[in-house]
């Protein structure tokens, strides 16, 4: 029923839409474009089940993990799906279900002491020592499969650019920070702030990869210096 | 868990000071930006302020502009509203709220009067 | 301000009939990264809002399939296609695109 949707004490939350450039006090701001959303997380009521979206881990249950539902499917759509039973194949830890870990691409039953040692190995390669209570918790306190993260994907949060896949930089996105596409050829850049300048840029683009530099558009002539068009070019 | 949970709130004086508290756990709380949202007694809800992910950037609403003041400790993953000047139309329950894959607490319910 | 405008205030409508609500805003919520900021929740006395559909057409996670949303720019629509006795309420329409958040007056929805 509705009510049974609507009201559990399960709280789920929705995947990020991705918003646009803003402006700062004074002028018209744009909020982040998400919604407060009260959501519930298991149903057994709902006739019609719909798939629940996610971009990391940690969105859904203790016993799913965050992926592509079709392999090799679109990246920007993933949902909750169920986790890994003992034997079955896996990529990262949190696709096995609670009381087993992936290795050598199987999942496979945790013995404690063993396990324990490989978590703190795989929490300094991912994120480094800072990192260690990244969601909020210890991560090296609990045997959860959700403790471990993969390289967060487009859209998800992060707190530096070392969070994020490749092709991925940590941006300020209105008034938090996630994964975005590092600039391609031609694409529109932003020459950044020296720090200690004043506005609010609540909407930051990513720089440019590799090979390439965020310079004036040679082609773009404006009256104005500083209204030139900036891009990504080869060095 | 992914949970929000407001606390602080409670009938006060006109003219008094409030601080509500929103303790986060379960997500990585200073990568997001944070909101307050207030529903009045069978109003709709309205948007009260909202902070940055490393606190350095806020704004307000205007009926609260100057009076209140959101902050956020992301060492301890909680969320403040220091309310004070409280007047009889800031009686509300008041959600802290998460934004980009948003979620939001229970509520916590201030009541100003004399 | 964006200001949200919705209609009708109130609708009363026999269980296994349709209904629809509309709301209009006082500007375009499409943004340039394509999507449009328009939400729809419902809020039952006592409780927090139960949001059911964002950027206008899609039904966060387990919501039943009879609310849809529709519409662009600054014309939106929900509608439930066969109201049921738990679907009373007051249904309000949000746009997210610019601070402050604004909300639509609501609609009473209740059954004949």
């Known amino acids: 029923t509705l009510n049974s949707v609507l009201n559990s004490n399960a709280i789920k939350n929705l995947p990020p839409p991705l918003g646009g450039a803003a402006g700062h006090p004074g002028s018209a701001v744009s909020a982040a474009p998400g919604i407060l959303y009260p959501g519930g997380n298991k149903y057994q009521t709902i006739d019609n089940y719909q798939p629940y979206p996610c971009a990391e881990d940690e969105e859904c249950g203790t016993d799913e993990y965050c992926a592509s539902p079709t392999r090799g499917g679109d990246a920007g759509v993933q949902i909750c799906l169920a986790c890994r039973k003992r034997r079955k194949r896996c990529m990262r830890h949190a696709m096995c279900c609670p009381g087993n870990y992936c290795k050598n691409g199987i999942c496979v039953s945790s013995d404690q002491n063993h396990f324990r040692g490989e978590i703190e190995e795989t929490i300094t390669e991912s994120f480094g020592n800072d990192h260690s209570t990244l969601d909020g918790y210890s991560r090296r306190t609990t045997l959860s499969s959700k403790m471990y993260h993969t390289k967060g994907q487009e859209g998800s949060v992060c707190l530096r650019s070392s969070d994020c896949a490749s092709g991925l930089c940590c941006d300020r996105h209105f008034w938090s920070k996630i994964c975005k596409p590092v600039l391609k050829e031609g694409q529109v850049c932003t020459k950044h702030r020296r720090k200690g300048s004043h506005g609010l840029e609540i909407f930051q683009r990513c720089y440019c990869g590799e090979g390439l530099s965020c310079r004036i558009q040679k082609d773009h002539h404006q009256a104005s210096n500083s209204s030139r068009l900036h891009t990504c070019q080869r060095h | 868990q992914v949970q929000l949970v407001e606390s602080g709130g409670g009938v006060v004086q006109p003219g008094r000071s409030l601080r509500l508290s929103c303790a986060a756990s379960?997500?990585?709380?200073?990568?997001?930006?944070m909101h307050w949202v207030r529903q009045a007694p069978g109003k709709g809800l309205e948007w009260v302020a909202v902070?940055?992910?490393?606190?350095?950037?806020?704004y307000y609403a205007d009926s609260v502009k100057g009076r209140f003041t959101i902050s956020r400790d992301n060492a301890k993953n909680t969320l403040y509203l220091q309310m004070n000047s409280l007047r009889a139309e800031d009686t509300a329950v008041y959600y802290c709220?998460?934004?980009?894959?948003?979620?939001w607490g229970q509520g916590t319910l201030v009541t100003v009067s004399s | 301000d964006i200001v949200m405008t919705q209609t009708p205030l109130s609708l009363s409508v026999t269980p296994g009939q349709p209904a629809s609500i509309s709301c209009k805003s006082g500007q375009s919520l499409l943004h340039n990264d394509g999507k449009t900021y328009l939400y729809w929740y419902l809020q039952k006395p006592g409780q927090p809002p139960q949001f059911l559909i964002y950027e206008v057409s899609n039904r966060f996670s387990r919501v039943p399939d009879r609310f849809s949303g529709s519409g662009s720019g600054t014309d939106f629509t929900l509608k439930i296609s066969r109201v049921e006795a738990e679907d009373v309420g007051i249904y309000y329409c949000m746009q997210s695109i610019q601070l402050p958040w604004t909300f639509g007056q609501g609609t009473q929805v209740e059954i004949k």
């Open positions: 379960g997500f990585t709380f200073s990568g997001y930006g």
């Open positions: 709220a998460r934004e980009l894959r948003v979620l």
């Open positions: 902070i940055s992910y490393d606190g350095n950037d806020k």
